[in-house]
């Protein structure tokens, strides 16, 4: 039994049942048609959550693009809707159905007006290029320290086997365009640049094409040549706060660091009536520090809930890396609840939280 590709020209709002896994359907729609793709669960069993992908990018539902677990509808199709569509299991990214969709300029009449561009049903899986591992192509920005090596990859497939070419900032990119040249591995769909320098910065696009279509992916390369420095803290953060007894308070600290920063929140305390030790170092207690499951984002915020008068005082955001430490401090003033009402009536400058 042939696992060949079924050739169809589909009229308006026709629903296309999904191919068996391993097949790729070649579908032609007319401009203005409603493209409907159907991908029933393999073997009729439960399918689980799915995602629809076009040319390697997840489709975002809209008024025109209707996404369901087993069906995709693209209303009022245009030439831009041509491409490689697939339905994938969300968790495993396993491809359940492949469709190669071409939207012709003329509305479809049920006849293949442009048949010479179409593959014959030879029993061979033919079709436009598609990304074979789109879930591994999410890293669009590469920030690379100078002198290191960069590899851009665009793993793809199609039949006939597509060609791959590369552009830099929209122009053809060849080895003679950079000192040190480039290394291409067509079988790995990759471009390698060794020992990058600042002039290598830019947008790099892979173009993968065969006679049935073309897909492209753009990556941005930034080459870092900064000398390492201690963390930089955003000016004005954390900011002084005035809060009402029993309210919630948040202090924010924005940290910039090339090197992995270690962030701590400290509260200044008194020991035996003194704020500093014999050597002049302030007495502090650590309120928040990096833990196994703590993200940098979480560490950039210190939350105090249901504040008491004891919470009033000086708070410090301390950020360190292998180069050194930086710190910014802010004060918390806690007002009694009655005062809040008076102040709010008079000036409106005190807030509860």
């Amino acid at each position: 039994e042939s696992l060949g590709t079924e050739q169809r020209v589909v009229g308006r709002a026709a629903e296309v049942p999904g191919p068996e896994p391993g097949q790729q359907e070649q579908l032609v729609f007319g401009s203005g048609d409603a493209v409907e793709l159907s991908c029933p669960p393999p073997g009729g069993g439960p399918m689980g959550p799915t995602v629809w992908v076009k040319d390697g990018t997840g489709l975002v539902p809209s008024e025109r693009v209707l996404v369901g677990p087993q069906r995709l509808q693209v209303l009022n199709a245009s030439h831009e809707d041509s491409g490689a569509y697939s339905c994938r299991q969300r968790l495993t990214q396993r491809v359940l159905c492949h469709f190669s969709v071409r939207v012709t300029d003329a509305p479809s009449s049920g006849d293949d007006e442009d048949g010479e561009d179409e593959a014959e049903d030879t029993g061979v899986d033919t079709g436009a290029p598609y990304w074979t591992r789109p879930e591994r192509m999410d890293k669009k920005l590469l920030a690379v320290p100078a002198a290191n090596t960069v590899r851009f990859r665009c793993p793809a497939a199609g039949n006939p086997t597509p060609s791959i070419s590369w552009l830099k900032n929209g122009r053809e990119f060849r080895g003679e365009h950079r000192i040190g040249g480039i290394k291409l591995r067509h079988q790995q769909w990759s471009l390698v640049m060794e020992s990058v320098v600042p002039s290598d910065r830019g947008n790099y696009t892979c173009v993968v094409e065969n006679k049935f279509g073309s897909i492209r992916q753009t990556y941005t390369l930034d080459v870092l040549e900064r000398s390492p420095h201690r963390p930089i803290l955003q000016a004005g953060l954390p900011a002084n706060q005035t809060a009402v007894l029993g309210s919630d308070v948040e202090f924010h600290c924005k940290v910039y660091s090339d090197a992995q920063p270690h962030i701590q929140w400290l509260k200044h305390v008194e020991v035996n009536g003194s704020k500093v030790g014999p050597d002049g170092t302030p007495y502090v207690t650590v309120l928040k520090t990096a833990g196994a499951n703590t993200t940098d984002k979480e560490l950039e915020v210190l939350s105090l809930h249901n504040v008491t008068f004891e919470d009033a005082g000086e708070y410090t955001c301390l950020a360190g890396n292998s180069i050194g430490f930086s710190h910014h401090s802010a004060w918390l003033v806690v007002l009694p609840a009655e005062e809040e009402l008076v102040e709010a009536d008079e000036a409106g400058s005190v807030y509860a939280g």
């Epitope: 590469l142 290191n148 090596t149 960069v150 590899r151 890396n321 292998s322």
Partner: antibody, heavy 127, light 107 residues
Framework: EVQLVESGGGLVQPGGSLRLSCAAS????????ISWVRQAPGKGLEWVGR????????NYADSVKGRFTISADTSKNTAYLQMNSLRAEDTAVYYC????????????????????WGQGTLVTVSS | DIQMTQSPSSLSASVGDRVTITCRAS??????LAWYKQKPGKAPKLLIY???FLYSGVPSRFSGSGSGTDFTLTISSLQPEDFATYYC?????????FGQGTKVEIK
């Protein structure tokens, strides 16, 4: 020309400490990394650990974690391997190697390649 | 840890021979594999990185291939200076691990 020169090896008793140095020249020191690899007499290569010279991050093999510390002085273009609580099985020639990253768009990992190596320094742990 | 197994452990060959050394990873390492050459009493030298990329200055008789778990280093025409021990090494997993080495000796 890239050069790496190790020093600091020698004979040390079990439980003792030693600090190896790796002086580097000929490349932008803080852009890449330094790895330490050892080779016991007549044996194969064993990766010990790595530091990224730009951010000071380090990784270690389980066999040395908690005992060995890799650091660097960027002002001197020198990396160090501080070895504490030494054991007989730590006896080996220790190499430092410049280590650059292959930053890959694929799957968000960085491959590390050791392209220039020092001549090695012998550490013998024996009583 | 990812185990790297080289075969053969040693081989005898003559100048001009085509030599193939294989390296198998205990789990998928994609193309994150390097090959090194080491002569007795000397530091290792990088030959191949990313499974198939020839490092600059390395003669073109050396080539690498493979991805996933199975990799090959080929010397198309063995030269006198190629008699040495060859190591594969992966760096996609932590820790980086080496194969046990393949010694290429003169027949």
């Amino acid at each position: 020309e890239v050069q790496l020169v190790e020093s600091g090896g020698g004979l040390v008793q079990p439980g003792g400490s030693l600090r190896l140095s790796c002086a580097a020249s000929g490349f932008p020191f803080t852009s890449t990394g330094i790895s330490w690899v050892r080779q016991a007499p007549g044996k194969g290569l064993e990766w010990v650990g790595r530091t990224h010279l730009g951010d000071g991050s380090t990784n270690y093999a389980d066999s040395v974690k908690g005992r060995f510390t890799i650091s660097a002085d960027t002002s001197k273009n020198t990396a160090y391997l501080q070895m504490n609580s030494l054991r007989a099985e730590d006896t080996a020639v220790y190499y430092c190697a410049r280590t650059y990253g292959i930053y890959d768009t694929y799957d968000m990992y960085t491959e590390y390649v050791m392209d220039y190596w020092g001549q090695g320094t012998l550490v013998t742990v024996s009583s | 840890d990812i185990q790297m197994t080289q075969s053969p452990s040693s081989l005898s060959a003559s100048v001009g021979d085509r030599v193939t050394i294989t390296c198998r990873a205990s789990q998928d390492v994609d193309t994150s594999l390097a090959w090194y050459k080491q002569k007795p009493g000397k530091a290792p030298k990088l030959l191949i990185y990313s499974a198939s990329f020839l490092y600059s200055g390395v003669p073109s008789r050396f080539s690498g291939s493979g991805s996933g778990t199975d990799f090959t280093l080929t010397i198309s025409s063995l030269q006198p200076e190629d008699f040495a021990t060859y190591y594969c090494q992966q760096s996609t997993g932590h820790p980086q691990t080496f194969g046990q080495g393949t010694k290429v000796e003169i027949k």
